[in-house]
């Protein structure tokens, strides 16, 4: 089955510059399929922009200036690139790559989409470091004792742009754990967001990781925030009457 | 030009109560196209749900049902037993891939329908309230309450800043909430919650301990940048 990954969750550009958005295709040979690019502007319908077919033929949507978008395909890295020229405010949108994926049954196809890249246009120069700054909160003793569970909270502050993805994993496991999160909030010129994870008592002695994807992470890799194991056996309790 | 128009911009649904989304086609006969449905969840993930001819995305067949009403020129998507995971924006889209002749393999989308999920009506439940701290940062965790209306107050004489609470549906179908703030005297901050005409304090849940083993790390400690993406 074809799978699409868009490594950039956001791309921030200044006016009239060129933006390049990437889409990595796996599970299918990129030179044996067509890759499509769509955009979703705020409050508008998702619109087809351009496609590159298996034989390299490029098709551009007729209602859009032909020089605005360019599409490329690099078989060696199994990547398709959408180039957006001369970026302007009207180009603020989420850009999705997509492909038709054949189902097991002959003749049945579905179009699958990548996770999208949000193009952000800014006219201000921000501080050098606008990556998310983490603060960790460990479970309160009261919660672990009374509820036989513990909540970890991962606070991320002073980041720009506002596009951020947070998920949680247990150490030595690639399973994404069910977490909850607040809305992204504006604080002066930057943003903050928090996410929390509640785990049962039996998991409190394991290390947990809050994994953060952001455009301005150092070296362009996901930031991993380590939550150490919690010792619950050393606590005696005498809860007040409820 | 062909246009796909959703019946509603927003559809509130209750957990477990079936819901129906409709999308009408303007300017063309719906029978000349294949209809698709997608869901966009938080973080912009666009997931395929259904395509005409009984094709469902992984994990959707049991809880979703797609249909076409040729007479009314509209597409229908039923969510048979909604859960909190079904919250998101739902899009209908059409194409003519494989119909022969001058086919188009691009999708034409309609505007999204925002589906908001609410817990089903249930007996009122009082929240548990816990405080978590790190440096000047304080978080008030409010767990497992119903109904949704709640006021969370972090009590301090030296407030730096406070943020609006996040209120979400818990896995058990009630509500959870977190309110964050920064305070100069974070050690003395407590949390009081007004819910269902009652007040619940974090101090009601405090425990006595003989240990300092359960410690908090310093701010921004335990952060690493791995080599893998």
């Amino acid at each position: 089955a074809g799978h699409l990954e868009q490594p950039q969750i956001s791309s921030t550009k200044t006016l009239s510059k060129t933006a390049r958005l990437e889409c990595v295709v796996s599970g299918i040979t990129i030179s044996a399929t067509s890759v499509y690019w769509y955009r979703e502007r705020p409050g508008e319908v998702i619109q087809f922009l351009v496609s590159i077919s298996y034989d390299g033929t490029v098709r551009k949507e007729s209602g859009i200036p032909s020089g605005k978008f360019e599409v490329d395909r690099i078989p060696e890295t199994s990547t398709s690139t959408l180039t957006i020229h001369n970026v302007e405010k009207q180009d603020i949108a989420t850009y999705y790559c997509a492909l038709w994926e054949a189902q097991q049954e002959l003749g049945k196809k579905i179009k699958v989409f990548g996770p999208g890249t949000k193009l952000i246009i800014t006219d201000k120069q921000l501080d050098a470091d606008v990556s998310p700054k983490p603060t960790i909160f460990l479970p309160s003793i009261a919660e672990t004792k009374l509820q036989k569970a513990g909540t970890y909270l991962c606070l991320l502050e002073k980041f720009f742009p506002d596009v951020i993805k947070i998920h949680w994993e247990e150490k030595k496991s690639n399973t994404i754990l069910g977490s909850q999160e607040g809305n992204t909030m504006k604080t002066n010129d930057t943003y903050m967001k928090f996410s929390w994870l509640t785990v049962p008592e039996k998991s409190l002695d394991k290390e947990h990781r809050c994994i953060v994807r952001h455009e301005n992470n150092k070296n362009g890799v996901d930031q991993e925030i380590i939550f150490p194991p919690i010792k619950t056996d050393v606590i005696t309790m005498d809860p007040k009457d409820n | 030009a062909i246009e796909l128009v959703p019946e509603h911009q927003t559809v509130p649904v209750s957990i477990g109560v079936p819901a129906t989304l409709r999308c009408s086609m303007k300017g063309e006969a719906i029978g000349n196209y294949y209809i698709n449905w997608y869901r966009k969840t938080q973080g912009n993930t666009m997931t395929f749900i259904y395509r005409e001819k009984d094709i469902y995305g992984p994990g959707f067949k049991d809880n979703f049902q797609g249909d076409i009403d040729i007479a009314k020129n509209l597409a229908v998507l039923k969510i048979l037993a909604p859960s909190e995971r079904d919250e998101g924006s739902y899009y209908c889209a059409c194409d003519t891939l494989g119909m022969g002749g001058e086919y188009t393999d691009k999708l034409i989308f309609g505007k999204g329908t925002r589906v908001t999920v609410e817990p089903r009506s249930q007996p009122h439940t009082k929240p548990s309230v816990f405080v978590m701290k790190n440096g000047t940062n304080v978080a008030c965790l409010v767990k497992e309450f119903y109904p949704k209306d709640i006021r969370i107050n972090l009590v301090s004489s030296k407030k730096i800043t406070e943020f609006d609470p996040a209120i979400v549906i818990s896995p058990s179908g009630k509500y959870n909430a977190v309110k964050l703030g920064k305070y100069e005297d974070s050690n003395s901050v407590t949390c009081s919650v007004q819910h269902d005409n009652k007040t619940v304090h974090s101090t009601d849940f405090e425990v006595k301990t003989d240990s300092t083993d359960h410690v908090k790390p310093k701010e921004t400690e335990n952060t690493k940048q791995p080599s893998k993406s």
């Epitope: 859009i64 200036p65 020229h85 001369n86 | -």
Partner: antibody, heavy 118, light 112 residues
Amino acid sequence: QVQLVQSGAEVKKPGASVKVSCKASGFTFTDHYINWVRQATGQGLEWMGQIYPGSGNTYYNQKFKGRVTMTRDTSISTAYMELSSLRSEDTAVYYCARNYGDYTIDFWGQGTSVTVSS
Amino acid sequence: DIVMTQSPDSLAVSLGERATINCKSSQSVLYSSNNKNYLAWYQQKPGQPPKLLIYWASTRESGVPDRFSGSGSGTDFTLTISSLQAEDVAVYYCQQYYRYHTFGTGTKLEIK
């Protein structure tokens, strides 16, 4: 400064092919489209097509499809236009010209004269 | 394909007088998203490549005298030379760059 330097004049027999080069300097070659426009003596300007050197993608005027091939060599910032099956009505000055994205053509080469005669 | 039609084919104007050249496109070259008309005007003198005068239908290229102005929107456009100078004798072309590129038929401007 921006320069587009084209190869010299060519005289060709009908049925032959001609390949004209266009060397770019003073700008980022891979970020601009290179267009080819021709002009027969006393006639107007006719857009033949364009290449995007960043990807090698080509877009041809329907009239020349099958007869024209546009290529590029990014290592030497040079674009090429080859026109095959030449006939007398292909006698013209051939210009390369650049444009950025959805901006218009803003800079032209000096032109290459191609004469097709038996 | 978008077809560009210019009128008149040729024009003779006295020095210091106004010259007006018209251009019509077979379909709109106005992109509603940015409200820009993808239309340019060029001047070409014998033995030289064309020179860009106006883009976005009305924006003068730097270094172009302000006697040159462009107007119009959608499908109908005009190039105006407010006070003709001897060095303005040339052929003028309109060009759409909304869908690739197409040039107009050209207008030869001479001194009366």
